[in-house]
């Protein structure tokens, strides 16, 4: 054996962010020499599951028929060939939505904003939470985090954007979460359409999509500017 076996590829279908009760399939793809595939979950001492490879032996399927809190977490997979075990795959973070009631997403002063001006997206939850996430549909990097610095829980988080450009236009949702498991998110807020006027092209409403929709290449990572709001929350860009 020349060196360590190449690591397999791990992914989830229809995506890695799954609503409570929905089904998800985790795939691990190795090589044609694989004899067994193993899926490990972080903090689980025993192999989380193991499967024979599907023909032609280069991948295995791990099915979750109904998503619950217990399945949310960080996974890695391995395969075993005649010469031993592979390196672990890159981690897959399986996130469940629907763990808490949905927050409300609004735009201040208005969801209709002129290019070059400022707007703040406000995500509000009924109960205090310590993490808020803003997602722009079809963005290449959809997650923006605002997380409490000292575990102090908040009812809301502000996502300021300044100056606004055409890139900021689109459909947004937000989620809230507790810090003890960032793999468990609330139900999504109702969508908010941010319309930026004064741009070269007319804004077109984006269709409502599930969070697990693959990122489109057309959108740049959303990077709101401006000062961090005085809410005890720290901004994290994912």
């Amino acid at each position: 054996q020349a060196g360590p076996l190449p690591k397999p590829t791990l992914w989830a279908e229809p995506g890695s962010v799954i609503s409570w009760g929905n089904s998800v399939t985790i795939w691990c793809q190795g090589t044609l020499e694989a004899r067994e595939y193993r899926l490990d979950k972080e903090e689980s001492p025993a192999p989380w599951d193991r499967q024979n490879p599907l023909e032609p032996k280069n991948k295995a399927r791990f099915s979750i028929p109904s998503m619950t809190e217990d399945y949310a977490g960080r996974y890695r997979c391995y395969y075993r060939s005649p010469v031993g075990w592979s390196q672990p795959s890159d981690p897959l973070e399986l996130v469940m939505t629907g763990a808490y009631s949905k927050p409300t997403l609004s735009a201040l002063p208005s969801p209709l904003v002129t290019s070059g001006k400022s707007v703040t997206l406000l995500c509000q939850s009924r109960s205090p939470m310590d993490t808020f996430l803003l997602i722009k549909e079809r963005a290449a990097h959809p997650l923006l985090h605002l997380r409490s610095e000292h575990g102090a829980q908040q009812h809301q988080a502000e996502f300021p954007m300044s100056p606004v450009t055409s890139v900021h236009g689109g459909t947004y949702r937000c989620f809230s979460s507790h810090g003890f498991s960032h793999y468990l998110l609330s139900h999504p807020s109702d969508p908010l359409e941010l319309i930026v006027s004064g741009s070269l092209e007319d804004p077109r409403p984006s269709p409502t999509r599930s969070v697990s929709t693959a990122a489109g290449p057309e959108d740049q990572p959303l990077m709101p500017t401006g000062s961090v709001p005085h809410s005890g929350l720290r901004r994290h860009w994912e």
């Epitope: 067994e36 689980s44 001492p45 025993a46 599951d49 217990d70 075993r80 031993g84």
Partner: antibody, heavy 124, light 107 residues
């Protein structure tokens, strides 16, 4: 010390179901998969299936997939094997057995502890 | 499923004899081969895993070797307490499968 204590002998009629229990002690129940193996009188060993007590994931021998159901109760560290639609050929000693990693190196797994066995007799 | 063929099905040997049992798999099992000892009326007991590794507490007179499809189990010096049936078992692919067993008796 590791112990797997199984329920007592059962006599069942053809078509009935049987549920065998296996109470584990002396180790962390959720850290090891539990296997079930049977042995007909004077015969060899036959694997039925396995269950991960930490999440309930199961794998079955195709031969038993439609008739065997493996479950666990983590609150009592007990594993169960239920076999339905019993026939005379199911008369056997049923064993639960702990499966886990043995060597320090990744991938050396085997059944290292067994229950004492439960005799299930299927007779009309 | 992988078929495991064990031979002989029974043997009789004297105390102190060297005893050898063979196990052949229907396909390459990459050394994922375990050996168990079962005494009458008792549950099986793990002796050797991964072809040649001695399980903790198992006497060193027991040993294993092999690769690919052909594997061997040896008792270097048979003792009265070794009277039992011995089973090989492959752990290379699901489902795990066992050999038919070899019954060892004292002459």
């Amino acid at each position: 010390q590791v112990q797997l204590v199984q329920s007592g002998a059962e006599v069942k009629k053809p078509g009935a179901s049987v549920k065998v229990s296996c109470k584990a002690s002396g180790y962390t129940f959720t850290n090891y998969w539990m296997h079930w193996v049977r042995q007909a009188p004077g015969q060899g060993l036959e694997w039925i299936g396995e269950i991960n007590p930490s999440n309930g994931r199961t794998n079955y021998n195709e031969k038993f997939k439609t008739r065997a159901t493996l479950t666990v109760d983590t609150s009592t560290s007990t594993a169960y094997m239920e076999l339905s639609s019993l026939r005379s050929e199911d008369t056997a000693v049923y064993y639960c057995a702990r499966w886990g990693q043995l060597g320090l190196r990744e991938g050396y797994y085997a059944v290292d502890y067994w229950g004492q066995g439960t005799l299930v007799t299927v007779s009309s | 499923d992988i078929q495991m063929t064990q031979s002989p099905s029974s043997l009789s040997a004297s105390v102190g004899d060297r005893v050898t049992i063979t196990c052949r798999a229907s396909q390459d099992i990459s050394n994922y081969l375990n050996w168990y000892q079962q005494k009458p009326g008792k549950a099986p007991k793990l002796l050797i895993y991964y072809t040649s590794r001695l399980h903790s507490g198992v006497p060193s007179r027991f040993s294993g070797s092999g690769s690919g499809t052909d594997y061997t189990f040896t008792i270097s010096s048979l003792q009265p307490e070794d009277i039992a049936t011995y089973y090989c078992q492959q752990g290379n692919t699901l489902p795990p499968t066992f050999g038919g067993g070899t019954k060892v008796e004292i002459k």
